[in-house]
């Protein structure tokens, strides 16, 4: 059983999910990789790549691209026009076979909210950020983009139990939770 | 506050390696990646690639494939960047940055170590 | 690779000039873009982020703009101290790029 810091977004509805997950470019380079929702104890998978892996090569699943850049041991994931129905916890894997997946720490859980008056919520009306919450307070440091400097925390100790076949992930210690406005 | 510190000017023959440090104090090193770049006299900036000091991964610009290795030591908030196989045209002004949350699509570099300044000359 | 073409490369204006400054990238960066003050023998510094955001304790006179392909950074009041190298740096794809470079001076 492996303990991980599930890590918690939230958007407006229309905005943009960017997130990056990285792995050893020497043991996974040239394996697939793929983009899982968490649904009840199974995973779904919403996209994968392709094999070989080529940089720069970008798939699209619906609202859902992956490239992967296996020269930097990076995938890029990015879902558009967010709904509020995409809310729940997604974790990139190393896509072996459907039952053989490895998980790419860290699990996202993303919240999705409805914008002030129904309309899409946009980065570019906010500005601050939550990136520069003080070090002393760890947990809260947020990225790049974030607009209010407000950081919700979740109840202490909270603990989500997801599995993917053949392994049993306890999400402990959700605390780190990050309001992050992105373009639509 | 937010530093990243580097380790001083070096003067290393062709054919040799060199190895720039990076401190960084406050804030969580495992939750951002550090990123190098480098700036030879007169020139632009060039991003050599970035780690992730949490999982310890990295990936590197192909022209620097095989030649960079960027490692760390969490004990310390210490990143590292071994350049092997030097030559005169590596000659430049090597900086960390501390990029992007480490599981966030951004690479926007915030703050910058004071760069190194690694001569190469025989 | 995106390659980011800044123009112009260098620039003489007086105190309270508005200054102006392009980066164009060879392909669409959505608002993926950058944008660091850079003086002599000194780091980089950040000014913009994500095309138009500024930077916290950056002044208000330096603003950014665009998106996809043209971006222009602006100062709209040019003070002494702005006398520097300005970059502007994509991060949609990489491997990241920066652009030349405008070195901006006072007349």
């Known amino acids: 059983t492996t303990e991980l810091t599930e890590e918690k977004y939230e958007y407006k509805e229309g905005q943009t999910l960017e997130v990056k997950c990285d792995y050893a470019l020497e043991k996974y380079a040239n394996s697939r990789k793929a983009w899982q929702k968490m649904e009840g104890k199974m995973p779904k998978i919403l996209a994968k790549t392709e094999r070989p892996s080529e940089n720069s090569h970008p798939v699209q699943v619906g609202r859902i691209t992956l490239e992967d850049y296996p020269d930097h041991g990076l995938l890029q994931v990015r879902m558009t026009n967010l709904q509020v129905e995409d809310s729940g916890l997604y974790q990139c894997v190393i896509y072996q076979h459907p039952k053989e997946s490895h998980v790419l720490f860290n699990p996202i859980c993303l919240v999705v909210t409805k914008g002030s008056s129904g309309t899409p919520g946009s980065s570019e009306n906010s500005t601050q950020n939550v990136y520069r919450t003080p070090s002393t307070t760890a947990k809260a440091l947020g990225p790049r983009y974030t607009s209010p400097r407000t950081v919700t925390q979740a109840p202490p100790e909270s603990t989500v139990v997801v599995s993917t076949p053949g392994s049993e992930i306890n999400l402990t210690n959700v605390t780190d939770i990050i309001r992050v406005p992105v373009f639509n | 506050q937010v530093q990243l510190v580097q380790s001083g000017a070096e003067v290393k023959k062709p054919g040799a390696s060199v190895k720039v440090s990076c401190k960084a104090s406050g804030y969580t090193f495992t939750s951002y990646d550090i990123n190098w770049v480098r700036q030879a006299t007169g020139q632009g900036l060039e991003w050599m690639g970035r780690?992730?000091?949490?999982?310890?991964?990295?990936g590197y610009v192909q022209n620097f494939r095989g030649r960079v290795t960027m490692t760390r030591d969490t004990s310390i908030s210490t990143a590292y960047m071994e350049l092997s196989s030097l030559r005169s045209e590596d000659t430049a002004v090597y900086y960390c940055?501390?990029?992007?949350?480490?599981?966030?699509?951004?690479?926007?570099?915030?703050?910058w170590g004071q760069g190194t300044l690694v001569t190469v000359s025989s | 690779d995106i390659q980011m073409t800044q123009s112009p490369s260098s620039l003489s204006a007086s105190v309270g000039d508005r200054v102006t400054i392009t980066c164009q990238a060879s392909q669409d960066i959505s608002k993926h873009l950058n944008w660091y003050q850079q003086k002599p023998g000194k780091a980089p510094k950040l000014l913009i982020y994500?095309?138009?955001n500024l930077e916290t304790g950056v002044p208000s006179r330096f603003s950014g703009s665009g998106s996809g392909t043209d971006f222009t950074f602006t100062i709209s009041s040019l003070q002494p101290e702005d006398i520097a190298t300005y970059n502007c740096?994509?991060?949609?794809?990489?491997?990241?790029?920066f652009g030349g470079g405008t070195k901006v001076e006072i007349k």
């Open positions: 994500d095309t138009s």
């Open positions: 940055a501390r990029g992007g949350r480490t599981s966030i699509w951004s690479f926007v570099f915030d703050y």
């Open positions: 740096q994509q991060y949609d794809k990489l491997p990241l790029t």
């Open positions: 780690m992730n000091p949490k999982s310890g991964n990295a």
